[in-house]
Interface confidence: low
């Protein structure tokens, strides 16, 4: 089932795990292009960011909620 899911997703015009512009992304999401831009990275290096790949998996695929007692509805 997972293989089919990823196969389908990989045929999308834009890979959903490549960008931070989806409903499941958080303010802490940063795209790899931004991470690799040294001048940008220097100004924000004090902040912890997550990658769109991680957020795609943990927030869209796994649909993590804020806690076991706060079920999500992603």
């Amino acid at each position: 089932a997972w293989a089919t899911y990823y196969l389908f997703q990989s045929f999308q015009k834009e890979l959903p795990w490549a960008h931070c512009n989806h409903s499941w992304n958080t303010p802490h999401c940063m795209e790899d292009t931004m991470r690799k831009n040294k001048s940008v990275w220097i100004t924000i290096s004090s902040t912890n960011f997550t990658s769109p790949v991680i957020e795609f998996w943990e927030r869209n695929v796994l649909s993590l909620s804020p806690g076991i007692d706060h079920p999500g509805s992603l």
């Epitope: 409903s23 958080t26 303010p27 802490h28 999401c29 004090s46 927030r59 804020p66 806690g67």
Partner: antibody, heavy 120, light 108 residues
Framework: QVKLQQSGAELMKPGASVKISCKAT????????IEWVKQRPGHGLEWIGE????????NYNEKFKGKATFTADTSSNTAYMQLSSLTSEDSAVYYC?????????????WGQGTLVTVSA | DIQLTQSPTTMAASPGEKITITCSAS???????LHWYQQKPGFSPKLLIY???NLASGVPARFSGSGSGTSYSLTIGTMEAEDVATYYC?????????FGGGTKLEIK
């Protein structure tokens, strides 16, 4: 269950510094952002900033840069906020809260608040 | 910074009455990052609704939320005495996260 226990009320002199603690229990402390919020009577709620205990990473509201400093001790599951150069404007109730895993579902759990009074 | 403006600032309602509180954002935010809190006098804020319309654990079904873009609202289907509190909206869309000024709800 998740619980955030804050340190007790503080009466401070102008110019002094104060360090507030927030002890977390009932979840994996390192994986969730700890948020800090200020509340003054008639001023509503103000977000000061946040710290991710696992990495020590921080985000500050520009307004509180130089005023607040966040630290976290993962061995004791405790987050700290130090407020420096205190003035009467810093008299308020300060809350710690737990942010969502990897982002924002709102602040689902709150400490009981720490009252800081600055008076000569 | 994104400013959140709540209205009304204060209001009084009779038991059983339907209440609507609005929250207007200075710029568009994703509905995934708009939350509501309830704060009773002398207590910490409590998460009421997260991601615009999801009820937090233990929150009665008479509470509901809706909205998108710059306009959001919190509705209490039938006001009860225990709903006397101050209600705040909050955005987690961009740093710094901000709260609305609050709506103080009283009972007639």
């Amino acid at each position: 269950q998740v619980k955030l226990q804050q340190s007790g009320a503080e009466l401070m002199k102008p110019g002094a510094s104060v360090k507030i603690s927030c002890k977390a229990t009932g979840y994996t402390f390192s994986r969730y952002w700890i948020e800090w919020v200020k509340q003054r009577p008639g001023h509503g709620l103000e977000w000061i900033g946040e710290i991710l205990p696992g990495s020590g990473s921080t985000n500050y509201n520009e307004k509180f840069k130089g005023k607040a400093t966040f630290t976290a001790d993962t061995s004791s599951n405790t987050a700290y906020m130090q407020l420096s150069s205190l003035t009467s404007e810093d008299s308020a109730v300060y809350y710690c809260a737990r942010g969502g895993f990897l982002g924002h579902y709102g602040f689902a759990y709150w400490g009981q608040g720490t009252l800081v009074t600055v008076s000569a | 910074d994104i400013q959140l403006t709540q209205s009304p600032t204060t209001m009084a309602a009779s038991p059983g009455e339907k209440i609507t509180i609005t929250c207007s954002a200075s710029s568009s935010i994703s509905s995934n990052y708009l939350h509501w809190y309830q704060q009773k006098p002398g207590f910490s804020p409590k998460l009421l609704i997260y991601r615009t319309s999801n009820l937090a654990s233990g929150v009665p079904a008479r509470f509901s939320g809706s909205g998108s873009g710059t306009s959001y609202s919190l509705t209490i289907g039938t006001m009860e005495a225990e709903d006397v509190a101050t209600y705040y909206c909050q955005q987690g869309s961009s740093i710094p996260y901000t709260f609305g000024g609050g709506t103080k709800l009283e009972i007639k």
